[in-house]
Protein backbone atom coordinates (compact mmCIF):
# COMPACT_ATOMS: atom_id res chain seq x y z
CA UNK A 1 0.00 0.00 0.00
CA UNK A 2 1.21 3.48 -0.78
CA UNK A 3 0.92 6.15 1.91
CA UNK A 4 2.12 9.76 1.90
CA UNK A 5 5.42 9.98 0.07
CA UNK A 6 6.10 6.28 0.37
CA UNK A 7 6.46 4.30 -2.85
CA UNK A 8 6.48 0.68 -1.77
CA UNK A 9 4.92 -1.30 -4.60
CA UNK A 10 3.03 -4.59 -4.23
CA UNK A 11 5.02 -7.67 -5.26
CA UNK A 12 2.35 -8.73 -7.75
CA UNK A 13 2.60 -5.51 -9.71
CA UNK A 14 3.04 -6.08 -13.46
CA UNK A 15 6.11 -4.46 -15.03
CA UNK A 16 3.89 -3.14 -17.78
CA UNK A 17 0.44 -2.37 -16.48
CA UNK A 18 -2.59 -2.09 -18.76
CA UNK A 19 -5.33 0.35 -17.76
CA UNK A 20 -8.74 1.34 -19.06
CA UNK A 21 -8.63 4.85 -20.49
CA UNK A 22 -11.39 7.33 -21.14
CA UNK A 23 -10.60 10.92 -22.23
CA UNK A 24 -6.94 10.24 -21.36
CA UNK A 25 -5.99 7.70 -24.04
CA UNK A 26 -2.61 8.36 -25.65
CA UNK A 27 -2.31 8.22 -29.45
CA UNK A 28 -0.98 4.65 -29.40
CA UNK A 29 -3.75 3.21 -27.23
CA UNK A 30 -5.98 0.46 -28.66
CA UNK A 31 -9.57 -0.30 -27.62
CA UNK A 32 -9.43 2.24 -24.80
CA UNK A 33 -6.49 0.47 -23.14
CA UNK A 34 -3.19 2.22 -22.34
CA UNK A 35 0.06 0.81 -20.95
CA UNK A 36 2.29 2.22 -18.23
CA UNK A 37 5.24 1.53 -15.93
CA UNK A 38 3.26 3.23 -13.19
CA UNK A 39 -0.37 3.35 -12.13
CA UNK A 40 -3.91 3.18 -13.42
CA UNK A 41 -6.19 5.98 -12.30
CA UNK A 42 -9.83 6.96 -12.21
CA UNK A 43 -10.66 10.59 -11.59
CA UNK A 44 -13.83 12.51 -10.93
CA UNK A 45 -14.06 16.24 -11.55
CA UNK A 46 -16.82 18.79 -11.43
CA UNK A 47 -17.29 20.92 -14.53
CA UNK A 48 -18.38 24.56 -14.62
CA UNK A 49 -22.04 23.59 -14.48
CA UNK A 50 -21.52 21.31 -11.47
CA UNK A 51 -21.79 18.10 -13.48
CA UNK A 52 -19.47 15.27 -12.36
CA UNK A 53 -17.10 14.06 -15.09
CA UNK A 54 -15.43 10.67 -14.63
CA UNK A 55 -12.31 9.85 -16.62
CA UNK A 56 -9.55 7.25 -16.42
CA UNK A 57 -6.16 6.36 -17.80
CA UNK A 58 -2.48 5.64 -17.19
CA UNK A 59 0.02 7.48 -15.01
CA UNK A 60 3.77 7.12 -15.40
CA UNK A 61 5.73 6.00 -12.36
CA UNK A 62 7.64 9.32 -12.33
CA UNK A 63 5.51 11.88 -10.54
CA UNK A 64 2.80 9.43 -9.53
CA UNK A 65 3.28 10.36 -5.87
CA UNK A 66 1.73 13.79 -6.36
CA UNK A 67 -0.71 12.67 -9.05
CA UNK A 68 -2.22 9.96 -6.83
CA UNK A 69 -2.56 12.31 -3.88
CA UNK A 70 -5.42 14.74 -4.21
CA UNK A 71 -3.79 18.15 -4.59
CA UNK A 72 -5.75 21.34 -3.92
CA UNK A 73 -7.21 23.25 -6.83
CA UNK A 74 -9.10 26.50 -6.39
CA UNK A 75 -12.87 26.86 -6.73
CA UNK A 76 -13.47 23.42 -8.27
CA UNK A 77 -13.68 19.86 -7.03
CA UNK A 78 -11.61 16.89 -8.13
CA UNK A 79 -10.68 13.52 -6.69
CA UNK A 80 -8.39 10.80 -8.01
CA UNK A 81 -7.69 7.18 -7.07
CA UNK A 82 -4.84 4.98 -8.31
CA UNK A 83 -4.16 1.24 -8.41
CA UNK A 84 -1.54 -1.22 -9.63
CA UNK A 85 -2.56 -4.67 -8.46
CA UNK A 86 -3.75 -6.01 -11.83
CA UNK A 87 -4.44 -5.02 -15.40
CA UNK A 88 -7.46 -2.75 -15.81
CA UNK A 89 -7.78 -2.42 -12.04
CA UNK A 90 -9.09 1.11 -12.45
CA UNK A 91 -12.42 -0.32 -13.65
CA UNK A 92 -13.06 -0.95 -9.96
CA UNK A 93 -12.11 2.50 -8.70
CA UNK A 94 -14.97 4.80 -7.77
CA UNK A 95 -13.65 8.12 -6.43
CA UNK A 96 -16.24 10.52 -5.06
CA UNK A 97 -16.25 14.30 -5.09
CA UNK A 98 -15.30 15.90 -1.78
CA UNK A 99 -18.03 17.73 0.13
CA UNK A 100 -18.57 21.27 -1.08
CA UNK A 101 -17.98 22.88 2.29
CA UNK A 102 -14.61 21.25 2.94
CA UNK A 103 -12.16 22.56 0.36
CA UNK A 104 -9.10 21.39 2.25
CA UNK A 105 -10.03 17.71 2.06
CA UNK A 106 -7.15 17.29 -0.32
CA UNK A 107 -4.43 17.46 2.30
CA UNK A 108 -5.14 13.86 3.25
CA UNK A 109 -3.51 10.58 2.29
CA UNK A 110 -2.87 9.26 -1.17
CA UNK A 111 -5.96 7.62 -2.60
CA UNK A 112 -4.72 4.21 -3.49
CA UNK A 113 -6.42 0.88 -3.84
CA UNK A 114 -4.53 -2.38 -3.37
CA UNK A 115 -5.99 -5.84 -2.93
CA UNK A 116 -9.38 -4.37 -2.05
CA UNK A 117 -7.77 -2.18 0.61
CA UNK A 118 -9.44 1.15 0.08
CA UNK A 119 -8.36 4.50 1.53
CA UNK A 120 -11.03 7.14 1.56
CA UNK A 121 -10.63 10.48 3.20
CA UNK A 122 -13.99 12.12 2.72
Amino acid sequence: KKEDGESTAPTARPKVLRCKCHHHCPEDSVNNICSTDGYCFTMIEEDDSGTPVVTSGCLGLEGSDFQCRDTPIPHQRRSIECCTERNECNKDLHPTLPPLKDRDFVDGPIHHKHHHHHHHHH
Epitope: H24, M43, E45, I73
Partner: antibody, heavy 124, light 107 residues
Framework: QVQLQQPGAELVKPGASVKLSCKAS????????MHWVKQRPGQGLEWIGM????????NYNESFKSKATLTVDKSSSTAYMQLSSLTSEDSAVYYC?????????????????WGQGTILTVSS | DIQMTQTTSSLSASLGDRVTISCRAS??????LNWYQQKPDGTIKFLIY???RLHSGVPSRFSGSGSGTDYSLTIRNLEQEDIATYFC?????????FGGGTKLEIK
Protein backbone atom coordinates in the same frame (compact mmCIF):
# COMPACT_ATOMS: atom_id res chain seq x y z
CA GLN B 1 10.89 12.41 -18.65
CA VAL B 2 8.78 15.43 -19.49
CA GLN B 3 10.33 17.62 -22.20
CA LEU B 4 9.01 20.76 -23.87
CA GLN B 5 11.00 21.83 -26.92
CA GLN B 6 10.80 25.40 -28.20
CA PRO B 7 12.72 27.05 -31.03
CA GLY B 8 15.51 29.28 -29.70
CA ALA B 9 14.61 32.49 -31.51
CA GLU B 10 12.29 34.14 -34.03
CA LEU B 11 12.81 37.45 -35.82
CA VAL B 12 9.73 39.10 -37.32
CA LYS B 13 8.76 42.48 -38.72
CA PRO B 14 6.35 44.89 -37.02
CA GLY B 15 2.73 44.36 -38.05
CA ALA B 16 3.34 40.71 -38.93
CA SER B 17 2.18 37.58 -37.09
CA VAL B 18 4.19 34.70 -35.71
CA LYS B 19 3.28 31.19 -34.59
CA LEU B 20 5.46 29.87 -31.76
CA SER B 21 5.65 26.14 -31.16
CA CYS B 22 6.14 23.90 -28.13
CA LYS B 23 6.68 20.20 -28.82
CA ALA B 24 5.89 17.96 -25.86
CA SER B 25 7.26 14.49 -25.12
CA UNK B 26 7.60 12.08 -22.20
CA UNK B 27 3.95 12.18 -21.11
CA UNK B 28 0.37 11.88 -22.41
CA UNK B 29 0.02 15.24 -24.15
CA UNK B 30 -3.79 15.36 -24.08
CA UNK B 31 -4.05 15.01 -20.30
CA UNK B 32 -2.54 18.27 -19.04
CA UNK B 33 -3.21 21.96 -19.48
CA MET B 34 -0.46 23.82 -21.32
CA HIS B 35 0.29 27.39 -20.23
CA TRP B 36 2.11 30.21 -22.04
CA VAL B 37 4.11 32.87 -20.21
CA LYS B 38 5.79 36.07 -21.43
CA GLN B 39 8.97 37.63 -20.04
CA ARG B 40 10.17 41.00 -21.28
CA PRO B 41 13.93 41.66 -21.03
CA GLY B 42 14.93 42.20 -17.41
CA GLN B 43 11.33 41.98 -16.24
CA GLY B 44 8.92 39.63 -14.51
CA LEU B 45 6.67 36.89 -15.84
CA GLU B 46 3.19 37.38 -17.30
CA TRP B 47 0.70 34.56 -17.74
CA ILE B 48 -0.81 34.72 -21.25
CA GLY B 49 -3.23 31.84 -21.17
CA MET B 50 -3.74 28.08 -21.15
CA UNK B 51 -5.14 25.38 -23.41
CA UNK B 52 -6.35 21.86 -22.73
CA UNK B 53 -5.11 19.71 -25.63
CA UNK B 54 -7.92 17.16 -25.45
CA UNK B 55 -10.89 19.51 -25.45
CA UNK B 56 -9.26 22.58 -26.98
CA UNK B 57 -10.66 24.62 -24.07
CA UNK B 58 -8.79 27.86 -23.49
CA ASN B 59 -8.50 30.51 -20.77
CA TYR B 60 -6.81 33.80 -21.61
CA ASN B 61 -5.47 36.67 -19.61
CA GLU B 62 -7.73 39.56 -20.67
CA SER B 63 -4.59 41.59 -21.50
CA PHE B 64 -3.64 39.10 -24.23
CA LYS B 65 -7.06 38.19 -25.66
CA SER B 66 -6.62 40.26 -28.82
CA LYS B 67 -2.94 39.41 -29.14
CA ALA B 68 -2.57 35.64 -28.61
CA THR B 69 -4.36 32.60 -30.00
CA LEU B 70 -3.60 29.18 -28.51
CA THR B 71 -4.00 25.96 -30.48
CA VAL B 72 -2.70 22.38 -30.39
CA ASP B 73 -1.94 19.60 -32.82
CA LYS B 74 -2.66 16.38 -30.96
CA SER B 75 -1.10 14.18 -33.63
CA SER B 76 2.31 15.78 -33.17
CA SER B 77 1.90 16.61 -29.44
CA THR B 78 2.61 20.25 -30.18
CA ALA B 79 1.11 23.38 -28.67
CA TYR B 80 1.13 26.65 -30.60
CA MET B 81 0.69 30.30 -29.78
CA GLN B 82 0.01 32.75 -32.57
CA LEU B 83 0.80 36.40 -31.85
CA SER B 84 -0.70 38.98 -34.20
CA SER B 85 -0.10 42.64 -35.15
CA LEU B 86 3.35 42.55 -33.63
CA THR B 87 5.04 45.62 -32.17
CA SER B 88 8.27 46.16 -30.25
CA GLU B 89 6.24 45.62 -27.04
CA ASP B 90 5.89 41.98 -28.07
CA SER B 91 9.65 41.46 -28.12
CA ALA B 92 10.18 39.05 -25.22
CA VAL B 93 10.94 35.47 -24.27
CA TYR B 94 7.88 33.25 -24.52
CA TYR B 95 7.71 30.06 -22.47
CA CYS B 96 5.33 27.14 -22.62
CA UNK B 97 4.77 25.29 -19.35
CA UNK B 98 2.90 22.08 -18.63
CA UNK B 99 0.63 21.87 -15.63
CA UNK B 100 1.42 19.60 -12.70
CA UNK B 101 -1.88 17.75 -12.51
CA UNK B 102 -3.84 15.55 -14.85
CA UNK B 103 -7.14 17.29 -15.57
CA UNK B 104 -10.13 16.79 -17.81
CA UNK B 105 -12.33 19.78 -17.07
CA UNK B 106 -11.00 21.49 -13.95
CA UNK B 107 -8.46 24.29 -14.21
CA UNK B 108 -5.27 23.78 -12.23
CA UNK B 109 -2.67 26.47 -11.51
CA UNK B 110 0.72 24.76 -11.22
CA UNK B 111 3.35 25.37 -13.93
CA UNK B 112 5.45 22.29 -13.30
CA UNK B 113 7.57 21.78 -16.44
CA TRP B 114 8.91 24.60 -18.60
CA GLY B 115 10.30 24.86 -22.10
CA GLN B 116 13.59 26.70 -22.67
CA GLY B 117 11.72 29.67 -24.11
CA THR B 118 11.68 31.29 -27.55
CA ILE B 119 13.26 34.73 -27.89
CA LEU B 120 10.97 36.79 -30.11
CA THR B 121 12.46 39.92 -31.64
CA VAL B 122 10.15 42.32 -33.46
CA SER B 123 12.24 44.60 -35.62
CA SER B 124 12.24 46.06 -39.09
CA ASP C 1 -6.19 41.19 -11.06
CA ILE C 2 -4.37 40.08 -7.92
CA GLN C 3 -1.07 41.93 -7.51
CA MET C 4 1.91 39.94 -6.23
CA THR C 5 4.66 41.98 -4.58
CA GLN C 6 8.20 40.85 -3.85
CA THR C 7 9.52 43.89 -2.01
CA THR C 8 13.15 42.79 -2.17
CA SER C 9 14.28 42.84 -5.79
CA SER C 10 17.80 41.65 -4.98
CA LEU C 11 19.44 39.95 -2.06
CA SER C 12 23.06 39.19 -1.21
CA ALA C 13 23.99 36.23 0.95
CA SER C 14 26.96 33.99 1.70
CA LEU C 15 27.20 30.32 0.91
CA GLY C 16 25.84 28.31 3.84
CA ASP C 17 23.46 31.11 4.88
CA ARG C 18 19.76 30.77 5.53
CA VAL C 19 17.85 33.05 3.12
CA THR C 20 14.18 34.06 3.24
CA ILE C 21 12.38 35.62 0.27
CA SER C 22 8.99 37.23 0.84
CA CYS C 23 5.92 37.60 -1.32
CA ARG C 24 2.69 39.48 -0.62
CA ALA C 25 -0.64 39.17 -2.44
CA SER C 26 -3.08 42.07 -2.77
CA UNK C 27 -5.83 39.80 -1.40
CA UNK C 28 -6.21 36.42 0.30
CA UNK C 29 -5.08 33.67 -2.09
CA UNK C 30 -5.97 30.70 0.14
CA UNK C 31 -2.49 29.15 0.05
CA UNK C 32 -2.48 28.86 -3.76
CA LEU C 33 1.05 30.23 -3.86
CA ASN C 34 3.81 28.68 -5.96
CA TRP C 35 7.55 29.40 -6.22
CA TYR C 36 9.79 29.21 -9.29
CA GLN C 37 13.54 29.50 -9.80
CA GLN C 38 14.98 31.13 -12.91
CA LYS C 39 18.67 30.54 -13.59
CA PRO C 40 20.81 33.18 -15.34
CA ASP C 41 20.51 31.21 -18.61
CA GLY C 42 16.71 31.64 -18.49
CA THR C 43 15.87 28.09 -17.41
CA ILE C 44 12.83 28.00 -15.13
CA LYS C 45 12.18 25.33 -12.49
CA PHE C 46 9.08 24.68 -10.40
CA LEU C 47 10.09 24.53 -6.73
CA ILE C 48 7.14 24.69 -4.36
CA TYR C 49 3.39 24.49 -4.85
CA UNK C 50 0.41 25.15 -2.62
CA UNK C 51 2.59 27.23 -0.25
CA UNK C 52 4.75 24.45 1.17
CA ARG C 53 4.77 21.31 -0.99
CA LEU C 54 8.11 20.52 -2.59
CA HIS C 55 7.99 19.47 -6.22
CA SER C 56 9.72 16.17 -6.95
CA GLY C 57 13.49 16.47 -7.23
CA VAL C 58 13.69 19.76 -5.35
CA PRO C 59 16.30 19.65 -2.54
CA SER C 60 14.88 19.63 1.00
CA ARG C 61 16.85 22.77 1.87
CA PHE C 62 14.01 24.65 0.14
CA SER C 63 10.83 25.23 2.13
CA GLY C 64 7.77 27.44 1.88
CA SER C 65 5.33 28.87 4.39
CA GLY C 66 2.60 31.46 4.80
CA SER C 67 -1.14 32.01 4.62
CA GLY C 68 -3.68 34.62 3.65
CA THR C 69 -1.71 37.32 1.84
CA ASP C 70 1.85 36.77 3.17
CA TYR C 71 4.15 33.99 2.00
CA SER C 72 7.83 33.18 2.08
CA LEU C 73 10.43 30.88 0.56
CA THR C 74 13.36 29.80 2.74
CA ILE C 75 16.63 28.31 1.54
CA ARG C 76 18.79 26.72 4.23
CA ASN C 77 22.53 26.22 3.72
CA LEU C 78 22.69 28.29 0.56
CA GLU C 79 24.63 26.61 -2.25
CA GLN C 80 26.26 28.06 -5.35
CA GLU C 81 23.65 26.39 -7.57
CA ASP C 82 20.89 28.35 -5.78
CA ILE C 83 22.07 31.60 -7.34
CA ALA C 84 19.06 32.59 -9.40
CA THR C 85 15.97 34.80 -9.48
CA TYR C 86 12.96 33.53 -7.52
CA PHE C 87 9.38 34.29 -8.51
CA CYS C 88 6.17 33.73 -6.59
CA UNK C 89 2.89 33.08 -8.42
CA UNK C 90 -0.69 33.05 -7.22
CA UNK C 91 -2.98 30.32 -8.56
CA UNK C 92 -6.16 31.21 -6.71
CA UNK C 93 -7.76 33.48 -9.29
CA UNK C 94 -7.52 33.92 -13.05
CA UNK C 95 -5.51 35.56 -14.46
CA UNK C 96 -2.61 33.91 -12.65
CA UNK C 97 -0.05 36.54 -11.67
CA PHE C 98 3.63 36.55 -10.67
CA GLY C 99 5.71 38.62 -8.34
CA GLY C 100 8.44 40.79 -9.83
CA GLY C 101 11.18 38.41 -8.72
CA THR C 102 13.98 38.43 -6.16
CA LYS C 103 17.50 38.05 -7.52
CA LEU C 104 19.76 36.12 -5.17
CA GLU C 105 23.46 36.89 -5.37
CA ILE C 106 26.56 35.73 -3.53
CA LYS C 107 28.28 38.20 -1.17
Amino acid sequence: QVQLQQPGAELVKPGASVKLSCKASGYTFISYWMHWVKQRPGQGLEWIGMIHPNSGSTNYNESFKSKATLTVDKSSSTAYMQLSSLTSEDSAVYYCARDLLIATVVVTPYFAYWGQGTILTVSS
Amino acid sequence: DIQMTQTTSSLSASLGDRVTISCRASQDISNFLNWYQQKPDGTIKFLIYYTSRLHSGVPSRFSGSGSGTDYSLTIRNLEQEDIATYFCQQGNTLPYTFGGGTKLEIK
